[in-house]
């Protein structure tokens, strides 16, 4: 069976394509596809920020090549940012740190 | 229960700390910690490349701030690169693409 980290990477890839394949360019997320991905797959990250301006800002921040879509590389940068936020939270609670084995 | 993508991000974080906490700076991976992480958690990526020179080269490539350790941000860049390699493989097989619902 795949190791948890390999499985995690597979989930990153398959989740992207689950939504990118719905409309237009099947290898990119447009705004509505990104919105659906966030709402369904990252509800903890999204929280209550469901207003249109918040989505537009997020889309703009992710879209580094300014083509009004989020490609896989831009999506990876986004997930890395979320992971880094999670990591900062994790590092803030030393009692939750894994101990030496 | 956490969505698969949220779980994947959690695995990314927890896997890093599972190894970074073993020696020295508990928030960074030194060479031996990185080697152990790769061997145990990413065996498919690693394949047969277990020679010292390959590890040195990989360590050097990941260590963008040149402190001889891999911090969480550098680790995220690394995982993103692997994810992008997986994605290229995935995109190369259009029959595996999710269809419109």
């Amino acid at each position: 069976m795949a190791c948890p980290l390999e499985k995690a990477l597979d989930v990153m890839v398959s989740t992207f394509h689950k939504y990118s394949g719905k409309e237009g360019d099947k290898f990119k997320l447009n705004k509505s596809e990104l919105k659906e991905l966030l709402t369904r797959e990252l509800p903890s990250f999204l929280g209550k920020r469901t207003d249109e301006a918040a989505f537009q800002k997020l889309m703009s921040n992710l879209d580094s090549n300014r083509d009004n879509e989020v490609d896989f590389q831009e999506y990876c940068v986004f997930l890395s940012c979320i992971a880094m936020m999670c990591n900062e939270f994790f590092e803030g609670f030393p009692d939750k740190q894994p101990r030496k084995k | 229960m956490a969505c698969p993508l949220e779980k994947a991000l959690d695995v990314m974080v927890s896997t890093f700390h599972k190894y970074s906490g073993k020696e020295g700076d508990k928030f960074k991976l030194n060479k031996s910690e990185l080697k152990e992480l790769l061997t145990r958690e990413l065996p498919s990526f690693l394949g047969k490349r277990t020679d010292e020179a390959a590890f040195q080269k990989l360590m050097s490539n990941l260590d963008s701030n040149r402190d001889n350790e891999v911090d969480f941000q550098e680790y995220c860049v690394f995982l993103s690169c692997i994810a992008m390699m997986c994605n290229e493989f995935f995109e190369g097989f259009p029959d595996k693409q999710p269809r419109k619902k």
């Epitope: 237009g24 705004k31 301006a53 703009s60 921040n61 300014r66 009004n68 | -």
Partner: antibody, heavy 120, light 107 residues
Framework: QVQLQESGPGLVKPSQTLSLTCTVS?????????WNWIRQHPGKGLEWIGH???????NYNPSLKNRLSMSRDTSKNQFSLKLSSVTAADTAVYYC?????????????WGQGTLVTVSS | DIQMTQSPSSLSASVGDRVTITCRAS??????LNWYQQKPGGALKLLLY???RLHSGVPSRFSGSGSGTDYTLTISSLQPEDFATYYC?????????FGGGTKVEIK
């Protein structure tokens, strides 16, 4: 109300470097926007030069890329443009603009523009 | 680069007239089309973005339509302050490109 103001020398000698700064007021210089330079040659159309935005991400017009450099100073609410090896063809009115985060990323606020003449 | 072609390059009209300006892109720009107004010696002002969305403070006599490669800016009833030059701009991809402009003059 957002205001943008271009500043810099109005006359630059050929082969030298054109340097312009745009000061943003009335709004925080946030990551939510991209900050652009656009020029208009005398009596002609508009040409997008480049922009700087989220996380310091920079995109340049490929036709000018080799001569361009853009930067920003968030503490001063400023961003700047450097265009090297200028010729008479670089004579234009230079505008700084804010690029909105809405669909199509329109330029929603513009400076008044500053005329830069390249001449010896 | 995406080429943007505007027509006509100039037109004469009277106050109260309905004015139509067209813009054609060299490829599909997926409605990412913005319109600007420039008065002599002045800065540009955003009128419409994403084909038909009115920027805040812009009068409702301005409207936009189109899809694919062909787009239109319409001024339903020309006012004295509308005599200016109008530019279309694609926001679909980099580098951003503009149309050559349409000068609206008093007849």
């Amino acid at each position: 109300q957002v205001q943008l103001q271009e500043s810099g020398p109005g006359l630059v000698k050929p082969s030298q470097t054109l340097s312009l700064t745009c000061t943003v007021s009335g709004d925080s210089f946030t990551n939510d926007y991209y900050w652009n330079w656009i020029r208009q040659h005398p009596g002609k159309g508009l040409e997008w030069i480049g922009h700087i935005g989220y996380g310091g991400n920079i995109n340049y017009n490929p036709s000018l890329k080799n001569r361009l450099s853009m930067s920003r100073d968030t503490s001063k609410n400023q961003f700047s443009l450097k265009l090297s090896s200028v010729t008479a063809a670089d004579t234009a009115v230079y505008y700084c603009t804010r690029e909105s985060f809405y669909d199509g990323y329109p330029f929603d606020y513009w400076g008044q523009g500053t005329l830069v003449t390249v001449s010896s | 680069d995406i080429q943007m072609t505007q027509s006509p390059s100039s037109l004469s009209a009277s106050v109260g007239d309905r004015v139509t300006i067209t813009c054609r892109a060299s490829q599909d720009i997926r409605n990412y089309l913005n319109w600007y107004q420039q008065k002599p010696g002045g800065a540009l002002k955003l009128l419409l973005y994403y084909t038909s969305r009115l920027h805040s403070g812009v009068p409702s006599r301005f409207s936009g339509s189109g899809s694919g490669t062909d787009y239109t800016l319409t001024i339903s009833s020309l006012q004295p302050e509308d005599f200016a030059t109008y530019y279309c701009q694609q926001g679909n991809s980099l580098p951003r490109t503009f149309g050559g402009g349409t000068k609206v003059e008093i007849k």
